[in-house]
Interface confidence: low
């Protein structure tokens, strides 16, 4: 709050802007008839130093010259970079109670002369863009520094623009606002940057460039693709480019891919034929441009063109499997199943499947189309039957896949041996086996089939299967494998006209069952007790049940119960026991055991045998 220096003046020598490391002399002079009232000798001038509005020093001891009561000169040294404020105050020594009165003040700026600007780089974005240059200013000057960018071209053409740096803004880029047209392509241009502040000036070295050096083409636009004869694998990519473009880079990839296909195209003139596309695939296309084969810069990538290639007829072989069930003495039900083609084989949206069941002697042919991946028909049990399935999209159908309908488990000699199922982790099971011992015909392939052992699974759910070559004796099954569920696993060995199978149960993870079987009835027949039960509900089994245990003990006995262990069979729901005494009341209960342990006991039933036991 200096009151416009009414009392006096402050001057600086050599100047209010000094180089780093220099000293300055600050003189404070009172105006005539100013000062302490009528006692000039009592005028005392003091100099205070402020940095960032904070008083840091009283320079009383730095006085180098003093005209008593009129003026004082102070020498200041070791000033730091930036701005420092000095305030001269008048202290009337005969009046100790009054604070010193401000006389005047001055700001001294300490800085450095600008370094020559370096690393000038100029760019014109597109043929219609404007030239913009950037540079490295060098060390901070701590002073307001003006920069001038000057461009010189043919026919003494020049243009320039200016900006400045200070403690609030940095100037290291300028847009000249002029456009260099392609007809200046062979011309050379010179650009230089000059920096000036109160401590000096400097100029960059001249930077020379041509049109091709600095013009970055605009990214291509209006990208489209035309598929030749609605082909799914061949298309002509078309785009609009700036007129001078001679080189393009194309990149394209399926949308779910992580790596681009890259193509360089010279003199493409906005058109390029692609021949290796995948049908019925969402692709992303981008294009970049360059104005010169060797020099110049690539444009940014264009905006993406996203489009799907057309369909082509399916290729590949459908994976077919089937189930046979006899209905009565002269009819059987054939259920055919097949797996969907993967996208690279389907090459389009599969509209339907063509299914054919044919008696080999061509007496009977059943044909149908379905949109599902299964088909069921009732056919005579007589004759040799073959099935074929092909997949159709809008462009055509795949080659039919044939399979002979044989009695899948009809030939004991073809049954694989030593089938085992081991849990590998939470969601797969390793199935191993040994080949049939005495097969009278060669095994063409193995089929490993699995199905959750739950009520109605045969009718509700299609089977899952894997085809295994004849020289492999193991399969890791993982499709639709969930922990704590028991699966029936069949290994089929198929020859040309026969089949043999072996069955095993397996799970990928198991726990002890949640509950035991529920005893529903105890009946006495021919001196034996028959225990009947209902199976544990499917969700509570928590894996493959290995066996059931029936426990019994006399009603009020504290002795350990006796038990009978029964191998688990899904079809069995009663079992005889014959070691109970007549006319003694027993308590009976059951538990179930998986590989992880035994369930809690099921319900308790009391029973008193009447007849004569063993």
């Amino acid at each position: 709050n200096i009151d416009v220096c009414k009392l006096g003046t402050v001057t600086v020598q050599p100047a209010p802007v000094i180089p780093l490391g220099s000293a300055a002399n600050i003189s404070c002079s009172l105006n005539p008839k100013q000062g302490c009232s009528h006692y000039p000798s009592s005028n005392e001038l003091i100099l205070l130093k402020f940095v960032n509005d904070v008083l840091v020093e009283n320079l009383h001891g730095k006085k180098v010259h003093d005209h008593t009561g009129h003026s004082s000169t102070f020498q200041v040294t070791n000033l730091s970079l930036g701005m420092t404020l000095f305030v001269c105050k008048l202290n009337c020594s005969n009046s100790q109670k009054k604070p010193p009165v401000p006389v005047c003040g001055v700001e001294i700026s300490v800085g450095v002369a600008p370094e020559p600007p370096q690393n000038i780089s100029c760019v014109q974005e597109g043929e219609n863009g404007t030239v913009a240059c950037s540079w490295n200013s060098g060390k901070v000057t701590y002073l307001k520094t003006n920069y001038t960018l000057q461009l010189s071209g043919p026919n003494n053409l020049t243009c320039q623009k200016q900006c400045f740096s200070d403690n609030r803004q940095n100037c290291n880029r300028l847009d000249l606002g002029i456009n260099l047209s392609p007809d200046l392509a062979e011309s050379r241009f010179i650009v230089r940057v000059t920096a000036i502040n109160d401590l000096g000036n400097s100029s960059s070295l001249p930077h020379t460039f041509t049109f091709l050096d600095i013009v970055i083409p605009l990214p291509p636009w209006d990208i489209r693709i035309n598929f030749l004869n609605a082909s799914g694998s061949r298309g002509t990519l078309q785009w609009e480019d700036e007129g001078q473009v001679v080189l393009n880079q194309l990149r394209y990839q399926p949308l779910n891919s992580t790596s681009w296909n890259m193509v360089n195209a010279t003199n493409a003139k906005g058109k390029y034929d692609l021949r290796d596309l995948r049908p019925f695939t969402e692709y992303e296309f981008q294009i970049s441009s360059k104005l010169h084969l060797s020099g110049g810069s690539w444009s940014n990538w264009s905006e993406s063109l996203r489009t799907r290639t057309p369909e082509e007829e399916p290729v590949g072989i459908l994976d077919i499997w089937y189930m046979k069930q006899d209905i009565d003495y002269d009819r059987q039900q054939i259920s055919l199943f097949w797996k969907s083609l993967n996208p690279s084989e389907a090459r389009g949206k599969i509209l339907h499947y063509q299914v054919t069941l044919q008696e080999v002697t061509k007496k009977t042919t059943l044909q149908n189309t379905t949109r599902h991946t299964s088909w069921t028909r009732v056919i005579p049990r007589t004759g040799a039957w073959t099935a074929s399935v092909s997949a159709a999209n809008s462009k055509g159908a795949s080659a039919p896949t044939h399979i002979n309908i044989v009695d899948l488990c009809g030939t004991g000699l073809l049954a694989p041996h030593q089938v085992s199922a081991k849990s590998e982790n939470m969601d797969n099971i390793l199935v191993t086996w040994q080949p049939p011992k005495k097969a009278d015909s060669a095994v063409r392939e193995y089929i490993v089939e699995w199905r959750a052992l739950q009520p109605g699974s045969i009718t509700k759910f299609p089977p899952h299967w894997l085809r295994i070559p004849p020289d492999n004796m193991s399969a890791l099954i993982s499709e639709n494998i969930k922990p704590y569920i028991c699966y029936e696993i069949r290994v089929h060995a198929l020859s040309e006209s026969q089949g043999g199978c072996s069955s095993i149960r397996g799970d990928s993870k198991h726990k002890a069952p949640v509950s035991g079987p529920h005893i529903t009835a105890i009946t006495e027949k021919k001196e034996r007790l028959f225990i009947s039960w209902t199976h544990i509900p499917f969700p509570e089994q928590r894996g493959c049940i290995l066996h059931y245990r029936i426990y019994w003990k006399e009603r009020d006995s504290t002795a350990q119960p006796e038990l009978c262990e029964i191998q688990y069979r899904r079809s069995q729901n009663s079992h005889p026991i014959s070691s109970l005494q007549p006319r003694v009341t027993y308590v009976l209960w059951m538990t179930a055991v998986t590989a992880a342990g035994e369930s809690p006991q099921g319900n308790e039933r009391e029973f008193c045998p009447q007849g004569k036991a063993n």
Epitope: N128, W221, D222, I225
Partner: nanobody, 127 residues
């Protein structure tokens, strides 16, 4: 929020002229595609003309070349379509579209790529 408002539609005899305007608010013209589309009853929306303000490129459908002219007035934030030598085939609802943010195989002609749309103005050409 961006708003596009078409005007200038109406009924005209074959051979006549109309000038459609599209007033744009909440949106700058710089470096964007803007276009005119039309939709005849029972037909799909088709591109008529477009302008790429970044490079100053102008596109026309073959059916309107040399008859229609697209232009813009940046100061007024307005897009125009001057339609001359109109024929009954030019009848339909005309829409203004802005900001082509996604490209499809049809390029500027594909209406799915534009971010902003007006409500449309009806043009009827009678013979």
């Amino acid at each position: 929020q961006v708003q596009l408002q078409e005007s200038g539609g109406g009924s005209v005899q074959a051979g006549g002229s109309l000038r459609l305007s599209c007033a744009v608010s909440g949106y700058t013209f710089s470096n964007h595609h803007m276009g005119w589309f039309r939709q005849a009853p029972g037909k799909e929306r088709e591109g008529v003309a477009a302008i790429y303000t970044g490079a100053g490129n102008i596109y026309y459908a073959d059916s309107v070349k040399d008859r229609f002219t697209i232009s813009k007035d940046t100061a007024k934030n307005t897009l125009y379509l001057q339609m001359n030598s109109l024929t009954p085939e030019d009848t339909g609802m005309y829409y203004c579209a802005a900001d082509l943010t996604r490209w499809y195989s049809g390029g500027w002609r594909d209406p799915r790529g534009y971010k902003y749309w007006g409500q449309g103005t009806q043009v009827t050409v009678s013979s």
